[in-house]
């Protein structure tokens, strides 16, 4: 057993252009906290896989409010170490995941919001009992400086915390055959560790993993009283012939239970009793329970009351991931229909609809002409979510309220004169041209069929609407 310790020295913008000014969003002040996760081995594991060696959360740091001037290179951090206790042997090779979280303290509807600011993942080799290792890592535009070490907790010592020590049995030296435990001069190496579960009262061992029984006891863990003993009559563990070796191979031989689980025989099989944080037939599955508080951002931990049942996090709207650690960009799913603008307000989605559409997702097509009157005899034409008026002659504008001069756009070509008329406009063409807009030249031998001016209108008259 022992403790992994992580000391965060600084967290701040990395060097170079594009460094963020503040860890806080525009919504207001925030504060930082850290999560450390340890996984065994050097394999690349999914970020969601359990922190089998343990995890820890720091306290919240001081509140940070971005000042108008350039921010300090290092942000205010939580005080103290992050400590991750480990129950069994220190593996030596491990994956270290450090997450920097931001807690926003602005006027959040429904309270503070947590979001993952940076995550560094590093595979490392480290012997327990060694000095602090220092590291600098970049995560996006952020830079994290930290130190870490693994140390054993007495009576465990050694680079893997597997050697057990006990106090000296005599003032000047260790007991017979026992060497001092480095680096602790006042402690001595203990006898070998027996098979897991071996009875402390009725069993002993000379080699690690062994379980020899004292007279009158039998079974793989020396817990079964022997009705007839074939053991020698010696009464204590003073020599190799003191007791009985486990009779014959049993289902618990070699201890099939991983991760420090203890094995007990059942009829024709075995059963593993797993330590906290592990479950499965052979304790091979590492598990975090709801008591470890694995759900972030207001997530509710369901199940996982004990290591025999896995937990799941029910995430509040807007978050996802096995620990509710990922903020969902809900607008990326394009929930607003008919060209509506999506707004993620945190507590809910809002769609700002284009004219002519309504509903929570802009799904309702309004009757564009409902309640829309086109003046002066105009008719309403629906289309594309917006209404349009087709105006009667002589009127224009959005609602046909403006008087229109059909001649204003000079529709008559080649010097033709324009006359406003109740049915539209009429062009009086200059000699040599013809057509409704005087667009065609008359053949040299031809004559223009149009009169010089339509009956009832004199050229140059003010526009009249008959």
């Amino acid at each position: 057993a022992g403790v992994f310790e992580l000391q965060i020295h600084s967290f701040g913008p990395g060097p170079g252009p594009g460094a963020p000014r503040s860890p806080c969003s525009a919504r207001g002040p925030c504060r930082l906290f850290f999560r450390v996760c340890l996984k065994p081995g050097l394999s690349e594991e999914a970020a969601e896989s359990p922190c089998a060696l343990g995890a820890a959360l720091s306290a919240r740091g001081p509140v940070y409010t971005e000042q108008p001037e350039a921010p300090a290179p290092d942000l205010p951090l939580p005080n103290g170490l992050l400590q991750v206790p480990f129950r069994d042997a220190w593996p030596g090779t491990f994956s270290l995941i450090i997450e920097t979280w931001r807690e926003e303290l602005g006027d959040q509807i429904g309270g503070p919001a947590w979001s993952l600011l940076a995550r560094v993942t590093r595979r490392r080799r480290l012997a327990a009992g060694g000095p602090w290792a220092r590291d600098i890592q970049r995560a996006g535009a952020w830079e994290l400086r930290f130190s870490y070490r693994a140390r054993c907790e007495l009576p465990a010592v050694g680079t893997a915390c597997t050697r057990l020590c006990r106090p000296r049995s005599a003032p000047s030296r260790c007991g017979p055959g026992l060497r001092p435990c480095a680096p602790l001069e006042d402690e001595c190496e203990a006898p070998p560790v027996c098979r897991a579960g071996c009875s402390l009262e009725h069993g002993f061992c000379e080699q690690p993993g062994e379980c020899r029984c004292l007279e009158g006891w039998t079974g793989p863990l020396c817990m079964v009283p022997a009705s007839t003993s074939s053991c020698l009559g010696l009464r204590g563990p003073s020599s190799a012939t003191t007791g009985c070796l486990v009779p014959g191979p049993g289902p618990c031989d070699g201890n099939p239970c991983a991760n420090g689980g203890s094995c007990s025989e059942t009829p024709g099989s075995f059963e593993c009793t797993c330590p906290r944080g592990f479950y499965g037939l052979r304790c091979e599955v590492s598990g975090v329970t709801c008591a470890d508080g694995p759900c972030f951002n207001g997530g509710l931990c369901v199940g996982g009351a004990d290591p025999d049942s896995a937990y799941i996090c029910h995430c509040p709207p807007g978050f996802q991931g096995s620990n509710c650690e990922k903020r969902v960009d809900r607008c990326s799913l394009q929930p607003c229909r008919n060209g509506g603008l999506c707004l993620d307000l945190g507590h809910a989605l809002r769609c700002r609809c284009r004219a002519g559409f309504a509903g929570p997702r802009c799904e309702h097509n309004l009757d564009d002409c409902a309640g829309r009157a086109c003046a002066n005899g105009g008719t309403c034409v629906e289309g594309g979510g917006a209404h349009r008026c087709s105006c009667a002659l002589g009127f224009g504008g959005r609602d046909c309220r403006e008087r229109a001069d059909p001649c204003a756009a000079r529709p008559c070509a080649h010097g033709g004169r324009c006359y406003a008329h109740f049915s539209g406009l009429v062009c009086a063409c200059a000699p040599g041209y013809m057509g409704s807009r005087c667009e065609f030249p008359v053949h040299p031998d031809g004559v223009s069929a149009l009169p010089a001016a339509p009956p009832g209108l004199r050229p140059g008259d003010p526009q009249r609407y008959l």
């Epitope: 959040q108 008591a291 508080g293 207001g298 029910h314 709207p317 809910a348």
Partner: antibody, heavy 118, light 108 residues
């Protein structure tokens, strides 16, 4: 303004199924978790269960074998069914909205008293 | 499940005084996922505090919450006549969601 309104029979016979509906206005049922809570006369509050529009449900283990909560997004409603009722199920039943910041209740219906009696 | 025990069961005070209500959890409540509610006779509960110390919208600042781990407190300073009611705590750290048994705050 978010409002929740419970509806359903106020009297249910023992061994029958209690059915209640909660109609939500002022909030989209697809944007939140929704819950049922009950309160026996003169006693404290007991959480029954919750539902999300996606169909995710979670029930109180003490009631799990008898409870079903369902949701109808088209009507902006969610419902509670509690089977094999006894007199111990007599209570004021509240529907409530679960907040976005966590699984606490930020809006409640006014409650409806359901009496189990023959 | 997490069992929440509220004390005292009944608290008798006068308007203008300060009230301190306690809520103790049988297991540590992670991330301070604890809420407080007020319930008046014939009415539904009303959310006062969430996250152990954050006031809900529209709640006067005479209501404040504190605590962490297993011990939480709701404090009402300068009691007003409308504050006399039953108060419940609720944890939302893990399922099942559980409420305390309530503290009745009555006029002395």
């Amino acid at each position: 303004q978010v409002q929740l309104q419970e509806s359903g029979p106020g009297l249910v016979k023992p061994s029958e199924t209690l059915s209640l509906t909660c109609t939500v206005s002022g909030a989209s049922i697809s944007s939140f978790y929704w819950s049922w809570i009950r309160q026996p006369p003169g006693k404290g509050l007991e959480w029954i269960g919750y539902i999300y529009y996606s169909g995710t449900t979670n029930y109180n283990p003490s009631l799990k074998s008898r409870v079903t909560i369902s949701v109808d997004t088209s009507k902006n409603q969610f419902s509670l069914k509690l089977s094999s009722v006894t007199a111990a199920d007599t209570a004021v039943y509240y529907c409530a909205r679960i907040a976005v910041a966590g699984f606490f209740f930020d809006y409640w219906g006014q409650g409806t008293l359901v009496t189990v009696s023959s | 499940e997490i069992v929440l025990t509220q004390s005292p069961g009944t608290l008798s005070l006068s308007p203008g005084e300060s009230a301190t209500l306690s809520c103790r959890a049988s297991q540590s409540v992670n991330k301070n996922y604890l809420a407080w509610y007020q319930q008046k006779p014939g009415q539904a509960p009303r959310l006062l505090i969430y996250g152990a110390s954050s006031r809900a919208t529209g709640i006067p600042d005479r209501f404040s919450g504190s605590g962490s781990g297993t011990d939480f407190t709701l404090t009402i300073s300068r009691l007003e006549p409308e504050d006399f009611a039953v108060y419940y705590c609720q944890q939302y750290d893990r399922s099942p969601l559980t409420f305390g048994g309530g503290t009745r705050l009555e006029i002395k």
